[in-house]
Amino acid sequence: TIPPHVQKSVNNDMIVTDNNGAVKFPQLCKFCDVRFSTCDNQKSCMSNCSITSICEKPQEVCVAVWRKNDENITLETVCHDPKLPYHDFILEDAASPKCIMKEKKKPGETFFMCSCSSDECNDNIIFSEEYNTSNPDLLLVIFQ
C-alpha cells in the first residue's frame, strides 16, 4: 500500500497503484529514441540500444518502431503511456510480455510497431512470432 508518510496528491495519476493498492513501480525500457538500424528481412532483431532507462511514469510500457524507406532503416525505442496514441496509432499489444511487430499503414514507408510490458522487452523485436525461440513448441522441434 501507499506508505502513510508519502504525500498523496489530489491528482490521481501522481501515485499509481495496482489492484491491491500497492505503489506501482515503473518498468525498464530500451530508450535510444531514433537510431539507424541494420535490422532487415529477419525474424527478430536486437535493438543494439545500449541505454536502458527507468520509465518516467509507472503506467508506461516499452515501444519499438521500425521504419524503412528508400533511403534508410531506423529503429526507435522509447517508453510511452498506452492510453495515448503513438505515431497516431493505439498501442493495442501493450500488455504483451514480448515486442511482437505489427505492420501499420504509413504512406511512403514500411512501418512496424510493437509495445510490451516487461523489463527491457523492446530490446528484442520480433517480426514473426512463429519463429520466436521462447515458443515451447518450437523448442520441442529443435530438441527432437
Partner: nanobody, 122 residues
C-alpha cells in the same frame, strides 16, 4: 521487522553534491532489488534509480542519468545515492524502497523508508 532509514539530506547550492544513505535491517539486504524514489512538493513520485541483486546492475531515470550514482554495500546493509551537479528541480524528499515479488505473477511487496529532504537552492 523491515526497516529502512535514510540520511544525508540537507541544503545544498546548485551545482553541489550530496550523498544519501539508506540503512536497512530486518531482511537479507544483499538479495533485494532496491530503489531510490523522490517526491517534490505537491508532485507525484519519481523513480530515480534502481539497483538489482545479484549482479548489481544499475538503472536511472533520464532526468538524473550522468549526475546520480546508485550503489550498495551489502556488508554494511546500506544503499547509497551519490548526487552530483544538483539542480533546483532535484529538490524533493528522497525515499529508499525495496521490492520483492509476492509469488503471484506481476505483484510485489514494497517497503519504504521515512525519507530525507534534499533542498537545492542558492
Amino acid at each position: 521487522e523491515v526497516q529502512l532509514l535514510e540520511s544525508g539530506g540537507g541544503l545544498v547550492q546548485p551545482g553541489g553534491s550530496l550523498r544519501l544513505s539508506c540503512a536497512a535491517s530486518g531482511f537479507t539486504f544483499g538479495t533485494e532489488q532496491m530503489w531510490w524514489v523522490r517526491q517534490a512538493p505537491g508532485k507525484g513520485l519519481e523513480f530515480v534509480s534502481r539497483i538489482d541483486s545479484p549482479g548489481g546492475r544499475t538503472y536511472y531515470a533520464n532526468s538524473v542519468k550522468g549526475r546520480f550514482t546508485i550503489s550498495r554495500d551489502n556488508s554494511k546493509n546500506t544503499l547509497y545515492l551519490q548526487m552530483n551537479s544538483l539542480r533546483a528541480e532535484d529538490t524533493a524528499v528522497y525515499y529508499c524502497a525495496k521490492r520483492r515479488p509476492t509469488g503471484v505473477s506481476g505483484t510485489f511487496y514494497d517497503y519504504w523508508g521515512q525519507g530525507t529532504l534534499v533542498t537545492v537552492s542558492s
